[in-house]
């Protein structure tokens, strides 16, 4: 007998053939001999089977003989042997429904776990393989398990179940909320404005829920509070902010945020979480603050950086189209009776320079411009 | 000889409503699943909504979806299109069609149209 | 929705010229398509459905062939009278959809 294999909630089409190329009476039947539909002349008939307003046919085939069985919405409870009588011959179909659903919302938080279960007809032993967007492989039965979810699985996962060498595909359309990156660092000069922006690395339509940032600043012993705020279809209201430093927010996402001066006192590592309404767990993505301030005190020409620095950086002070004077692995380099001239204090990474500082000494008699 | 006359088209302002009606004579009307089919002024046909032989399955493309309702009376021969907020972009001849049979089938007659004009 | 795209828009021939016009699915129709001829202030008239089934009283210089995803209407000979406007149509779901159109004009 032909099998077939159908998708919970799609229409399946099953086909009957008479050898005659002509209209002729026909019946569909399930396997306890229910009529589902057949004709009376020209006309469509349905019987009393549970399937009597999903069922259909196409009238403009029959008079080629061909007398299709079309099943809306399809149950797995479908899962049946179709029975096609005419011309005194019977056509057997099997047809097994299977649904293939995420046991949670498809939008998951980062780190998350997606579970795809499959429902299948009794008697039925399917596998399923599914691909995920970064074509990750998995398999498994009745249930399939993904854990620690990372941004590059958002898209449409395709999993195809295979049942008596007859296959059919779904399409699963999965969106990993976090944010575009897991860490950032902005590097300023002291007085600088610091803006930072929290790009989301997905849209939905409404977007609720609220938000905090947390500051540990380099010289403070402890984290503190410096924003609190709520998002309400995706527009942004602060509810508290800390007076030092006094920090703005934009209206619209981006989460965006403004920190009016770069000053030693700020440089230091943030946490900003974000917490999605119906939605256990928070997004977090982390921020770095890192200042450069150079100065010259009598004699004494210093450069300094505070702030989240990896041991690699390398910070020199230099004047201008000269070799760098001094240049070291440390968070501060100075220069002892600078001669006249615009100074450069560099923050580099392996020749990239990441923050430049500029302070002109003038002749001894007088005293220094920093511009 | 199968026949289908539309009526009730003409000018509306956006935001408002008109009914059509398609009168059907010349086939047993209550044995077959309906349909109406629009066209714009320089483009394609577009279907708009179908309506199964007893009035028991209707269907609608997104885009008159929740604006747009389909309804037949088998005793009086007659197909109805209630088009509500009417856009400029409702601007189109209506032609009312018969499917071959059931609601899986093609058009096989059509009507010679009537003309919706949304416009302020 | 499955979307429908003919070719060509609009073509000139003769009379007595073969003409063939496509139709190309966005994906596997199942062979429902059909094909209207369109002449202006009249409704369509079917000509063509399941790919090669010709409605009757339609003349045998229109045919129809095609499978999968594409489609093609076939006039063998021109007829004076077939100057006009066809359009297919997908109905391999309840979300009927039709090509853009092609005019066939007098050359």
């Known amino acids: 007998k032909k099998v077939v294999l159908g998708k919970k909630g799609d229409t399946v089409e099953l086909t009957c053939t008479a050898s005659q190329k002509k209209s002729i009476q026909f019946h569909w039947k399930n396997s306890n001999q229910i009529k589902i539909l057949g004709n009376q002349g020209s006309f469509l008939t349905k019987g009393p089977s549970k399937l009597n307003d999903r069922a259909d046919s196409r009238r403009s085939l029959w008079d080629q003989g061909n007398f299709p069985l079309i099943i809306k919405n399809l149950k797995i409870e479908d899962s049946d042997t179709y029975i096609c009588e005419v011309e005194d011959q019977k056509e057997e179909v099997q047809l097994l429904v299977f649904g293939l659903t995420a046991n949670s919302d498809t939008h998951l938080l980062q780190g998350q776990s997606l579970t795809l279960t499959l429902e299948s007809p009794p008697g039925s032993s399917p596998s399923v393989q599914c691909r995920s967007p970064r074509g990750k492989n998995i398999q498994g039965g009745k249930t399939l398990s993904v854990s620690q979810l990372e941004l590059q699985d958002s898209g449409t996962w395709t999993c195809t179940v295979l049942q008596n060498q007859k296959k059919v595909e779904f399409k699963i359309d999965i969106v990993v909320l976090a944010f575009q990156k897991a860490s950032s660092i902005v590097y300023k000069k002291e007085g600088e404005q610091v803006e930072f922006s929290f790009p989301l690395a997905f849209t939905v339509e409404k977007l609720t829920g609220s938000g905090e940032l947390w500051w540990q600043a380099e010289r403070a012993s402890s984290s503190k509070s410096w924003i609190t705020f709520d998002l309400k279809n995706k527009e942004v209201s602060v509810k508290r902010v800390t007076q030092d430093p006094k920090l703005q927010m934009g209206k619209k996402l981006p989460l965006h945020l403004t920190l009016p001066q770069a000053l030693p006192q700020y440089a230091g590592s943030g946490n900003l979480t974000l917490a999605l309404e119906a939605k256990t767990g928070k997004l977090h993505q982390e921020v770095n603050l890192v200042v450069m301030r150079a100065t010259q005190l009598q004699k004494n020409l210093t450069c300094e950086v505070w702030g989240p620095t990896s041991p690699k950086l390398m910070l020199s002070l230099k004047l201008e189209n000269k070799e760098a004077k001094v240049s070291k692995r440390e968070k501060a380099v100075w220069v002892l009776n600078p001669e006249a001239g615009m100074w450069q204090c560099l923050l580099s990474d392996s020749g990239q320079v990441l923050l430049e500082s500029n302070i002109k000494v003038l002749p001894t008699w007088s005293t220094p411009v920093q511009p | 000889e199968v026949q289908l006359v539309e009526s009730g088209g003409g000018l509306v302002q956006p935001g408002g409503s008109l009914r059509l009606s398609c009168a059907a004579s010349?086939?047993?009307?209550?044995?077959?699943?309906m349909s109406w089919v629009r066209q714009a002024p320089g483009k394609r046909l577009e279907w708009v909504s179908a309506?199964?032989?007893?009035?028991?399955?209707?269907y609608y493309p997104d885009s008159v979806k929740g604006r747009f309702t389909i309804s037949r009376d088998n005793a009086k021969n007659t197909l109805y299109l209630q088009m509500n907020s009417l856009r400029a972009e409702d601007t189109a001849v209506y032609y009312c069609?018969?499917?071959?049979?059931?609601?899986?089938?093609?058009?096989?007659?059509w009507g010679q149209g009537t003309l919706v004009t949304v416009s302020s | 929705d499955i979307q429908m795209t003919q070719s060509p828009s609009s073509l000139s021939a003769s009379v007595g010229d073969r003409v063939t016009i496509t139709c190309q699915a966005s994906?596997?129709?199942?062979?429902?398509i059909a094909w209207y001829q369109h002449k202006p202030g009249k409704g369509p008239k079917l000509l063509i459905h399941?790919?090669?089934t010709l409605q009757p009283g339609i003349p045998s210089r229109f045919s129809g062939s095609g499978s999968g995803r594409d489609y093609t209407l076939t006039i063998s000979s021109l007829q004076p009278e077939d100057f006009a406007t066809y359009y297919c149509?997908?109905?391999?779901?309840?979300?009927?959809?039709f090509g853009g159109g092609t005019k066939v004009e007098i050359k």
């Open positions: 309506i199964s032989d007893h009035s028991t399955n209707t």
């Open positions: 010349g086939f047993t009307f209550s044995n077959y699943a």
């Open positions: 399941y790919t090669s």
């Open positions: 069609a018969r499917k071959y049979g059931g609601d899986y089938d093609p058009f096989d007659y």
């Open positions: 149509l997908q109905y391999d779901n309840l979300l009927f959809t």
């Open positions: 994906q596997d129709i199942n062979n429902y």
